[in-house]
C-alpha cells in the first residue's frame, strides 16, 4: 500500500525531515508550507492551520521559497554611473552594473555598489592592461619606436611609421613625419599589441602591466606594492 500523503501542517515522523517547500515550525512542532518567491509569511502555522502567505509589497521581494515575516527591501535606485540590468520585482532584487567606460570599484553580491571611471592614458602612454568589469585600465609609457597621441582608455602604443626620408622623428606622443610619399608601417621593437575591448563589460583578459616609474599624480594600482604604470589622467 502506498504511504498516505500528509497535508500540512503535520507532525513529522521521528528522525525524518520536512519535505521540499516545507519547513519545521519550532513553536507548532509541525511541518508547514513555505511561501513561494514573491510572497512572505503573513501568519505562521499552528498545529491546526497552515502558513498564511501574502504578496510582497512594492519595492520588496523574496527570491526563494521562504517563511520570512517580511519581504526584503530592494536595493536603492541605480546611480548615474550605473545601468539597471535587472529591475526590482516581487521575486528579484534590482541589479545595477557599471555603464560603459566605467568599472566596478566596490562590488556587492549581485551587481555593483560603486562604479568608477576607467582611467584614460594620456599622450605618450598606452593601455598595458585593458579595463574589465572589476578592474581599472593600466597605462604604460610607449616604448622607443612606438607612440600614442590620444587620451584614451582603450588605445595602445602604435609603431612609428618607417620613412624613406624622415622629416620629423617620432617620439612617445607623436608619429614620425616622412618627406617621402610612400611611408611603410613597421613593427617597431617594443610595440605593444593588446586586444581592444569592445565593451568593458565582458573584458576579462588582464595582460601583465610592465613596471614603470612612479608618476607625479595618483593612480589605481595593480596588486601589490610594485610601482604603478604611469600616464593616467582623469575622466
Amino acid at each position: 500500500l502506498p504511504a498516505q500523503v500528509a497535508f500540512t501542517p503535520y507532525a513529522p515522523e521521528p528522525g525524518s525531515t520536512c519535505r521540499l517547500r516545507e519547513y519545521y515550525d519550532q513553536t507548532a512542532q509541525m511541518c508547514c508550507s513555505k511561501c513561494s518567491p514573491g510572497q512572505h509569511a503573513k501568519v505562521f502555522c499552528t498545529k491546526t492551520s497552515d502558513t498564511v502567505c501574502d504578496s510582497c509589497e512594492d519595492s520588496t521581494y523574496t527570491q526563494l521559497w521562504n517563511w520570512v515575516p517580511e519581504c526584503l527591501s530592494c536595493g536603492s535606485r541605480c546611480s548615474s554611473d550605473q545601468v539597471e540590468t535587472q529591475a526590482c520585482t516581487r521575486e528579484q532584487n534590482r541589479i545595477c552594473t557599471c555603464r560603459p567606460g566605467w568599472y566596478c570599484a566596490l562590488s556587492k553580491q549581485e551587481g555593483c555598489r560603486l562604479c568608477a571611471p576607467l582611467r584614460k592614458c594620456r599622450p605618450g602612454f598606452g593601455v598595458a592592461r585593458p579595463g574589465t568589469e572589476t578592474s581599472d585600465v593600466v597605462c604604460k609609457p610607449c616604448a622607443p619606436g612606438t607612440f600614442s597621441n590620444t587620451t584614451s582608455s582603450t588605445d595602445i602604443c602604435r609603431p612609428h611609421q618607417i620613412c624613406n626620408v624622415v622629416a620629423i622623428p617620432g617620439n612617445a606622443s607623436m608619429d614620425a613625419v616622412c618627406t617621402s610619399t610612400s611611408p611603410t608601417r613597421s613593427m617597431a621593437p617594443g610595440a605593444v599589441h593588446l586586444p581592444q575591448p569592445v565593451s568593458t563589460r565582458s573584458q576579462h583578459t588582464q595582460p601583465t602591466p610592465e613596471p614603470s616609474t612612479a608618476p607625479s599624480t595618483s593612480f589605481l594600482l595593480p596588486m601589490g606594492p610594485s610601482p604603478p604604470a604611469e600616464g593616467s589622467t582623469g575622466d
Epitope: 562590488s107 599624480t217 575622466d235
Partner: antibody, heavy 121, light 110 residues
Framework: EVQLLESGGGLVQPGGSLRLSCAAS????????MSWVRQAPGKGLEWVST???????YYGASVRGRFTISRDNSKNTLYLQMNSLRAEDTAVYYC???????????????WGQGTLVTVSS | QSVLTQPPSASGTPGQRVTISCSGT????????VNWYQQLPGTAPKLLIY???QRPSGVPDRFSGSKSGTSASLAISGLRSEDEADYYC???????????FGGGTKLTVL
C-alpha cells in the same frame, strides 16, 4: 555603534617599515571603501590611500610605491604597510570610512581617533 | 602647498555669521562634490557637510555649504564658542586621481 580603531603606530628609524591596522565595528565592512588620511604635527590633512574591493586601490603621490593599503573583510580590518619611511611621513594616521552614493558623491563619513607615527633617528 | 585654497584664519563673535571659502579648479571642485570637515582641538576630523550642501544627521542646521563653479563655501550662522575649530574642505581631483584637501581654516570665536 560605528567605530574605527587604529593601532600600530610608534617610533621608527628612517628607511624602516611599520604596519598600521584599523579595526572596524558596527557596520558591514565590505560594503564600504576605506581610507587612510594623515596629519603632520601642526599641519593640515593629507589623503594617503583608499581601497575599495580587492585590488582597487588609490594612492597619494607622496606615498606611491612605498605604502600598500589592504583589507581583510573576514576580520573587518584595514591595513597600511609603510616601507622606506621618511621623516616627512611623521604624522597622526587616521582611518576613515568612505561613504558613497555615487562616484562623484563620496566623503569620509566616519573617522578613527588616529595613531601617531614618528620617523626619526 | 594645498591643491584647494582656504584662508588660514577666520573669526567672529557669538551669534554672528561667518563664511569660509575654498577655491579649486575644474578638475576638483567644479567636476566633483565638495565635503567639509570640522576638527575640534585635539580630536579627529568629523564630517560636517557632504555632496556640496548635505548635512549628516546630528549636524546643526547652523552649518550650510554651497558651491559655484570652482569655488565652494561653508557658512556658520549663530556662531557659538564650541564652533572654534579647524575647518577643511576636500574634493576628489580627476586629474590627480586622488583626494585633495584645503590647507584648513582656523576659526576663532572672539
Amino acid at each position: 555603534e560605528v567605530q574605527l580603531l587604529e593601532s600600530g603606530g610608534g617610533l621608527v628609524q628612517p628607511g624602516g617599515s611599520l604596519r598600521l591596522s584599523c579595526a572596524a565595528s558596527g557596520f558591514t565592512f565590505d560594503d564600504y571603501g576605506m581610507s587612510w588620511v594623515r596629519q603632520a604635527p601642526g599641519k593640515g590633512l593629507e589623503w594617503v590611500s583608499t581601497i575599495y574591493s580587492g585590488d582597487n586601490a588609490y594612492y597619494g603621490a607622496s606615498v606611491r610605491g612605498r605604502f600598500t593599503i589592504s583589507r581583510d573583510n573576514s576580520k573587518n580590518t584595514l591595513y597600511l604597510q609603510m616601507n622606506s619611511l621618511r621623516a616627512e611621513d611623521t604624522a597622526v594616521y587616521y582611518c576613515a570610512r568612505v561613504y558613497s552614493s555615487s562616484w562623484r558623491k563620496r566623503a569620509f563619513d566616519i573617522w578613527g581617533q588616529g595613531t601617531l607615527v614618528t620617523v626619526s633617528s | 602647498q594645498s591643491v584647494l585654497t582656504q584662508p588660514p584664519s577666520a573669526s567672529g563673535t557669538p551669534g554672528q555669521r561667518v563664511t569660509i571659502s575654498c577655491s579649486g579648479t575644474s578638475s576638483n571642485i567644479e567636476s566633483n562634490t565638495v565635503n567639509w570637515y570640522q576638527q575640534l582641538p585635539g580630536t579627529a576630523p568629523k564630517l560636517l557637510i557632504y555632496s556640496d550642501n548635505q548635512r549628516p544627521s546630528g549636524v546643526p542646521d547652523r552649518f550650510s555649504g554651497s558651491k559655484s563653479g570652482t569655488s565652494a563655501s561653508l557658512a556658520i550662522s549663530g556662531l557659538r564658542s564650541e564652533d572654534e575649530a579647524d575647518y577643511y574642505c576636500a574634493a576628489w581631483d580627476d586629474s590627480l586621481s586622488g583626494w585633495v584637501f584645503g590647507g584648513g581654516t582656523k576659526l576663532t570665536v572672539l
